[in-house]
C-alpha cells in the first residue's frame, strides 16, 4: 500500500492546525511541563512489518482524536480550528484503515503489534490523567497541545521512513 501523499499532507495540516490552536504563551506554562514518556522505541519502525507499523500510527491518531473530542477540549479550543483538526484526523484514520486492509492481504500477518499499541495507549492515559490532575487548566492543555505536536512530528519522521520503504 502506498501511504498516500494526501496522508502526508494531512499530517502537515494537522500540525499547522495544532500550532494555530495555541492561545497562551508556552513560556507562561513552564512550571506545568511534564514528561509523558512518549514511546519513541515504538516509532523506530525497523522491527515490524508495514501493517503493524500502520496500526501503531492508527492508534496514535485515534487516541489524539479521542482526546480532542472531549467536552473539556471543546471548552478550551477555538471551535472552528478544533473542527478542522478533528476532520483532518478523521481523514488520516480513514487513509490508514484502507492501507491496513490492503497490507494484511499482502502480508497475511496479524494486524496489530499488541505491545506497541499498548505502549501508545499508556502514553495517552498519562496525558489524560495529567489533565485530570491539573483540572483541565489552560496551562495543562497548552502543555498537552505542545506534547501532541511533538509526538506528531516524531511520527511524521516515522511515516516518511515508511514511505521510503515502499
Amino acid at each position: 500500500c502506498d501511504l498516500p501523499q494526501t496522508h502526508s499532507l494531512g499530517n502537515r495540516r494537522a500540525l499547522i492546525l495544532l500550532a494555530q490552536m495555541g492561545r497562551i504563551s508556552p513560556f507562561s506554562c513552564l512550571k506545568d511541563r511534564h514528561d509523558f514518556g512518549f514511546p519513541q522505541e515504538e516509532f523506530d519502525g525497523n522491527q515490524f512489518q508495514k501493517a503493524q507499523a500502520i496500526s501503531v500510527l492508527h492508534e496514535m491518531i485515534q487516541q489524539t482524536f479521542n482526546l480532542f473530542s472531549t467536552k473539556d477540549s471543546s471548552a478550551t479550543w477555538e471551535q472552528s480550528l478544533l473542527e478542522k483538526f478533528s476532520t483532518e484526523l478523521n481523514q488520516q484514520l480513514n487513509d490508514l484503515e484502507a492501507c491496513v486492509i490492503q497490507e494484511v492481504g499482502v502480508e497475511e500477518t496479524p494486524l496489530m503489534n499488541v505491545d506497541s499499541i499498548l505502549a501508545v495507549k499508556k502514553y495517552f492515559q498519562r496525558i489524560t490523567l495529567y489533565l485530570t490532575e491539573k483540572k483541565y487548566s489552560p496551562c495543562a492543555w497548552e502543555v498537552v497541545r505542545a506534547e501532541i505536536m511533538r509526538s506528531f512530528s516524531l511520527s511524521k519522521i516515522f511515516q516518511e521512513r515508511l514511505r521510503r520503504k515502499e
Epitope: G37, P39, Q63, N66, V114, D115, L118, A119, K121, K122, F124, Q125, R126, T128, L129, T132, E133
Partner: antibody
C-alpha cells in the same frame, strides 16, 4: 498463562527495612502497569502505587508517598515494594496486580498475585 | 479523594437467591466502576469491569449496571462459591479507591 507470583510471608521488627517481590510471567512485562494494593487483616483494600515497567514511570497514592517505594527489574520481570523503616501499622497483606487498559483508557485489575503477609512486631 | 460507599455492609442469603449490592461514588466516575470478589484467605478476583462488562470466565449470573455516581452488582441464583466479600472500585481519579466491602454470608 498470566501469573504474578509473590514472595512468602515476612516477620520484621519496627524500624527494619524490607523489600517484597512480585515475579511476573505469561505476557510481555513492559506492556502493562503493575500496582500494589494493601489489605490490613480483616479490613478493606487500599491502592498504594503503580508503575509502568517500560520506563519506571510511577504514580503514588499520597497516603503512601514517602513511606514506600516501588521499582522494577526488567531483566527478571519482577516488581518490588520497599520500606526503609517499617512501622507496626504496616502489618498487612500486600497484593501485586496487573492493570488492563481498555481502548477508552479505563484501567482495572485483571490479575492478582496471591499476596504477601508482612507482620511488623517488636 | 473519591469516596466509594457500598451498601449494605453485610448481607445474608441462601443458595439460589438473588442479591443486589450498590456502590456510590462521592463524585462522578463515569463508567470507571469495577467489581471484585474476595473469598476467605484468597486474593480478590475481577468480576465486572467498566460498570457492566463481564470478565472472561466469570459466570453470567453476575451483572453490573450504572454509571456516574452509582453502580450495582446483581448476583442471581447464588452458588456456594459466591459467599464472599465484594468490593467496588473506581479508577477515574487518583488515588484509586475501593468501597469498604460487602460481606455476603449464608442465611
Amino acid at each position: 498463562e498470566v501469573q504474578l507470583v509473590q514472595a512468602g510471608a515476612e516477620v520484621k521488627a519496627p524500624g527494619e527495612s524490607l523489600r517484597i517481590s512480585c515475579k511476573v510471567s505469561g505476557y510481555t512485562f513492559t506492556s502493562y502497569w503493575i500496582s500494589w494494593v494493601r489489605q490490613i487483616p480483616g479490613k478493606g483494600l487500599e491502592w498504594m502505587v503503580k508503575i509502568d515497567p517500560r520506563d519506571s514511570y510511577t504514580i503514588y497514592n499520597p497516603s503512601f508517598q514517602g513511606h514506600v517505594s516501588i521499582s522494577v527489574d526488567k531483566s527478571i520481570t519482577t516488581v518490588y515494594l520497599q520500606w526503609s523503616s517499617l512501622q507496626a501499622s504496616d502489618t498487612a497483606i500486600y497484593y501485586c496486580v496487573r492493570h488492563y487498559l481498555t481502548q477508552s483508557l479505563v484501567d482495572y485489575f485483571d490479575h492478582w498475585g496471591q499476596g504477601t503477609l508482612v507482620a511488623v512486631s517488636s | 479523594d473519591i469516596q466509594m460507599t457500598q451498601s449494605p455492609s453485610s448481607l445474608s442469603a441462601s443458595v439460589g437467591d438473588s442479591v443486589t449490592i450498590t456502590c456510590r461514588a462521592s463524585q462522578s466516575v463515569s463508567n470507571y466502576f469495577h467489581w471484585y470478589r474476595q473469598k476467605p484467605g484468597k486474593a480478590p478476583e475481577l468480576l465486572i469491569y467498566s460498570a457492566s462488562n463481564l470478565q472472561t470466565g466469570v459466570p453470567s449470573r453476575f451483572t453490573g449496571s450504572g454509571s456516574g455516581t452509582e453502580c450495582t452488582l446483581t448476583i442471581t441464583s447464588l452458588q456456594p462459591d459466591d459467599f464472599a466479600t465484594y468490593y467496588c472500585q473506581q479508577t477515574h481519579g487518583y488515588p484509586f479507591t475501593f468501597g469498604q466491602g460487602t460481606k455476603l454470608d449464608v442465611r
